[in-house]
Structures are given as C-alpha cells and as structure tokens.
C-alpha cells in the first residue's frame, strides 16, 4: 500500500483562534528525517501555511515567525496553528514527506476543515 | 513570464566531464523543488535527479549515482547538472524542470526547452 | 523501484475520436500520477496532475482517473493538436519513473 496520511476531518478553532490536529502516517520505510507541510485549500487556491523538517525523536522545528507548532511522537505529528481568524477558515491539508534515507516518499491527507469564528466584541462597560 | 532556459551542452567524449546550467526566471526560484529529466534521442523520458528549495536533500536515478551531481544556487536562480565519467548511454536531450504544484508533490509544471549533450569518441 | 507501463505504444485515431490510454504502476502509488503531452522537437507539457487534476490551461476534452496501481487517461474527442506522445509519470517515491510512452497518430 501506498504511504497513508490521516487527519481529522473537522476542527473548530478555540476563541483565542488557535486549532490543533493529528496528522498520522503510515510509513513505508524507516525515516530518519521527515518533512511535515501544511497546506490551506481554499476557493481552489492552494497556499503554504507553514513546514518543518524534523529528525524522528526529535522535536519539529518551525520559522520564528510561524503560525505553526508542533510535536512529534512516532508516525504521529501533533500540529497547533495559531492567530486564526474566521477569514482563515478553510480545509488544512497535511503533506508529509520521507526525506531521509532514500528512497524519498510522499502522502497528502485528505484535509482537516478549520472553522474559525471571530469572537464578539466585549461591550463598553461604564 | 515563467521560464526556464537551459545551457551548456555538447560534444564530448566517454570518460569526460560537462556542466550543465538552467537559468530560473519569472518565479521565486529559492522556493521550488527542481528537477533534471533526459531523453535519448528516439526514446522516452528519464528521470535524472532533484534537488529540493534549500538544496539540502537530493536524489539521483541509480545510472547516475556517484557520477552526477545537482547542485543550485539561488542568489542566482541556477539549477546545475555536473555531468562526470561520461559514457555513450548518457548522450540524450536534459530538461530541468520545476515541481510547482503543492498538492502533486513532483509534478513537473514548467520545463526548460532542453540542451543536447552527446557523448561520442 | 516503481515500474510504469503504458498500453497501448501507440494508437492510430481520427479527429473527433474517443481515445483512451492506460497506465499501470508496479506497487500502489496511491493518486500521485501525472500525464503530460510531448510532441516531437519539444518539451513535455503537464495535462494531468494528481491522477485527475486538470492542468491550468489544459482544455477540458482531456481527463484523468484512476488510483493505486491503474490510471487511465481520456482525451473525449480527438482534436488535431493532439496527435502527440503521451507519458504517464509517478510521483509518489524516488526514482520518479516514467512510462514508455504511448504515441497517438492520424489514421
């Protein structure tokens, strides 16, 4: 079988707009080094959110300046996208990668769909 | 417009070396996974290598393995073939190409009009 | 490594034609399978990614289906630019082979 990758179908950003989701993999090979992306569909434009390459056993390192975090725990990557806001409300696409050793393989989920809802503004208190 | 030229073929003979150029413009370059892809002349297409954005992980069809070498440089939108130890079953046209589609993963979106290396005695 | 085949090698077909052509991978490679159009002299062209994703560009007459280890390419009627060779391709893992080919030519 081809490299399977899971993800939840649904998820619903917190009110501080921060969602997290499992992408799962089935591996076809003993990886060493993984590449994790997340990709958002939406309107069929596809864009990248954010990437980490990360050794296995070792903690997943995103750029200072991602909306990303995450870990990793075997086959099994545990990913939190923050400042969400109801604009940002689209399907989430997990594309993971072997990178290391060869030979190189490639699975994409099938999309977890974050809602993100502004919350209501806090009336004027005198 | 996007586009991709490539540069540095030839004549040479079996035993000798080449490098081959493909010049990136119309796109951020530094941002894209590349690819070199050959054809022999009357036949069907063969992938050489790739080398991803950072140009950290590469890859190579085993014909080529220990004798090629991708390289790139992204200061100058570059993609690079070094070719050595050439042999007669290497003589064939070399396309670089581009993976650009996020959700096809090594899809090749945009090549190159290809450069004609042969090798002969 | 992943072995692609292609059926048939080459097919003889008129304007206005329904041609279809197969391509068969060795081991499952799920839906990450492209076409692409190659006509002599020239750089290939992707028409198909991702088993059934139609190429900005490409004209709707072609389509693509298919996924694990057979896929299938339809062109719905043959028009005359696209009398050409056409490759499948796997880009699920390294090497990324290619099929042998199947040219389409003018009966």
């Known amino acids: 079988k081809a490299m399977h990758v899971a993800q939840p179908a649904v998820v619903l950003a917190n009110s501080r707009g921060t969602a997290s989701f499992v992408c799962e993999y089935a591996s076809p090979g003993k990886a060493t080094e993984v590449r994790v992306t997340v990709l958002r569909q939406a309107d069929s434009q596809v864009t990248e959110v954010c990437a980490a390459t990360y050794m296995m056993g070792n903690e997943l390192t995103f750029l200072d300046d991602s909306i990303c975090t995450g870990t990793s725990s075997g086959n099994q990557v545990n990913l939190t996208i923050q400042g969400l806001r109801a604009m940002d409300t689209g399907l989430y696409i997990c594309k993971v990668e072997l990178m290391y050793p060869p030979p190189y393989y490639m699975g994409i989920g099938n999309g977890t769909q974050i809602y993100v809802i502004d919350p209501e503004p806090c009336p004027d208190s005198d | 417009q996007v586009q991709l030229v490539e540069s540095g073929g030839g004549v040479v003979q079996p035993g000798r070396s080449l490098r081959l150029s493909c010049a990136a413009s119309g796109f951020t370059f530094s941002s894209y996974v590349m690819h070199w892809v050959r054809q022999a002349p009357g036949k069907g297409l063969e992938w050489v290598a790739v080398i991803w954005s950072d140009g950290r992980n590469k890859y190579y069809t085993d014909s080529v393995k220990g004798r090629f070498t991708i390289s790139r440089d992204n200061s100058k939108n570059t993609l690079y073939l070094q070719m050595s130890s050439l042999r007669a079953e290497d003589t064939a046209v070399y396309y670089c190409a581009r993976s650009g589609i996020a959700l096809a993963g090594n899809a090749f979106d945009i090549w190159g009009q290809g450069t004609m290396v042969t090798v002969s005695s | 490594d992943i072995q692609m085949t292609q059926s048939p090698s080459s097919l003889s077909a008129s304007v206005g034609d329904r041609v279809t052509i197969t391509c068969r991978a060795s081991q499952s490679i799920s839906s990450y399978l492209n076409w692409y159009q190659q006509k002599p002299g020239k750089a290939p062209k992707l028409l198909i990614y991702?088993?059934?994703s139609l190429q900005s560009g490409v004209p709707s007459r072609f389509s693509g289906s298919g996924s694990g280890t057979d896929f299938t390419l339809t062109i719905s009627s043959l028009q005359p630019e696209d009398f050409a060779t056409y490759y499948c391709q796997q880009s699920y893992s390294t090497p990324f082979t290619f099929g042998p080919g199947t040219k389409v030519d003018i009966k």
């Open positions: 991702a088993a059934s």
